[in-house]
Interface confidence: low
């Protein structure tokens, strides 16, 4: 067990803070909840603290919860490939460019680390080149979320990882908005981290609303499990 992995044996409180600017529309989001890496489970509630969110909530899911991939469930035979937990408690910097097909892009930078016994994800997001009447600023996305695979590879030069995946957002007219994600994670501390073999995270997310919440918000339940690396051959013959 890596030093960081020991921090995830129980339920861990999570705080998410985001400051965003998309085409000059500035906003802030505050989220709180908890994660349980034993089950790869995240439960979070996000509130736009500046009024109405200028972009659809589903476009921010990867920035919020795919930001805390340290809660992914890594099966026993894959624990030596869990970069995310191994970087804790000092944490990691997570940078992304998200290209929305035929529309604009988000650039995000986040620091994900422990502050006391709370896992904190602090994010800055800048969005540019969006069409005012497009799927994003025009709020044409359905309020739901598809399952995805998130592909991870080691980046030995930077002592971190590179991550690529394509999100499929459902649009109200029945079509799909694609969002290409290019992600890089580097450790904040200088302690040893686990550099993985190529594998992927399988994600399932459910979006809902709190009937008692008057503010613009999103409730998120997510399950994430690592996969893509089989047992060694010796395991097959036991």
């Amino acid at each position: 067990m890596s030093k960081g992995e020991e921090l995830f044996t129980g339920v861990v409180p999570i705080l998410v803070e985001l400051d965003g600017d998309v085409n000059g529309h500035k906003f802030s989001v505050s989220g709180e909840g908890e994660g349980d890496a034993t089950y790869g489970k995240l439960t979070l509630k996000f509130i736009c603290t500046t009024g109405k969110l200028p972009v659809p909530w589903p476009t921010l899911v990867t920035t919020f919860s795919y930001g805390v991939q340290c809660f992914s469930r890594y099966p026993d035979h894959m624990k030596q490939h869990d970069f995310f937990k191994s970087a804790m408690p000092e944490g990691y910097v997570q940078e992304r460019t998200i290209f929305f097909k035929d529309d604009g892009n988000y650039k995000t930078r986040a620091e994900v680390k422990f502050e006391g016994d709370t896992l904190v994800n602090r994010i800055e997001l800048k969005g540019i080149d969006f069409k005012e009447d497009g799927n994003i600023l025009g709020h044409k996305l359905e309020y739901n979320y598809n399952s995805h695979n998130v592909y991870i590879m080691a980046d030995k030069q930077k002592n971190g990882i590179k991550v690529n995946f394509k999100i499929r957002h459902n649009i109200e007219d029945g079509s799909v908005q694609l969002a290409d994600h290019y992600q890089q994670n580097t450790p904040i501390g200088d302690g040893p981290v686990l550099l993985p073999d190529n594998h992927y995270l399988s994600t399932q997310s459910a979006l809902s609303k709190d009937p008692n919440e008057k503010r613009d918000h999103m409730v998120l339940l997510e399950f994430v499990t690592a996969a893509g690396i089989t047992h060694g051959m010796d395991e097959l013959y036991k």
């Epitope: 409180p13 709180e32 909840g33 509130i47 006391g116 016994d117 709370t118 709190d210």
Partner: nanobody
Amino acid sequence: QVQLVESGGGLVQAGDSLQLSCAFSGGTFSTYAMGWFRQAPGKEREFVGGISRSGATTNYEDSVKGRFTISKDNTKNTVYLQLNSLKPEDTAVYYCAARNNILPVTTIDKYEYWGQGTQVTV
């Protein structure tokens, strides 16, 4: 200095309900996560449930899930514990506790402030 005062305890029949209150003073209530604990005679103090500083997130000990409900009113500086379908094994002194953090945790020593407790007898 933060002070916590519990009230609402009493003697009830099995299956009855009670609402415990915990009045908070001497600090900024909205920055504190709150926990409820209980201690039965001859036993260690145990976590019952907790609520995050905003009131958005709650968690409960398994034996009280579905029976007990915690709520937090940041305008009244009060946290509540609603006890339904009470059982004899719920008999204990109930304490509320505050920690200057986002979320409650089950660990006793993570809480900075404690009330004096209120007795619940079933």
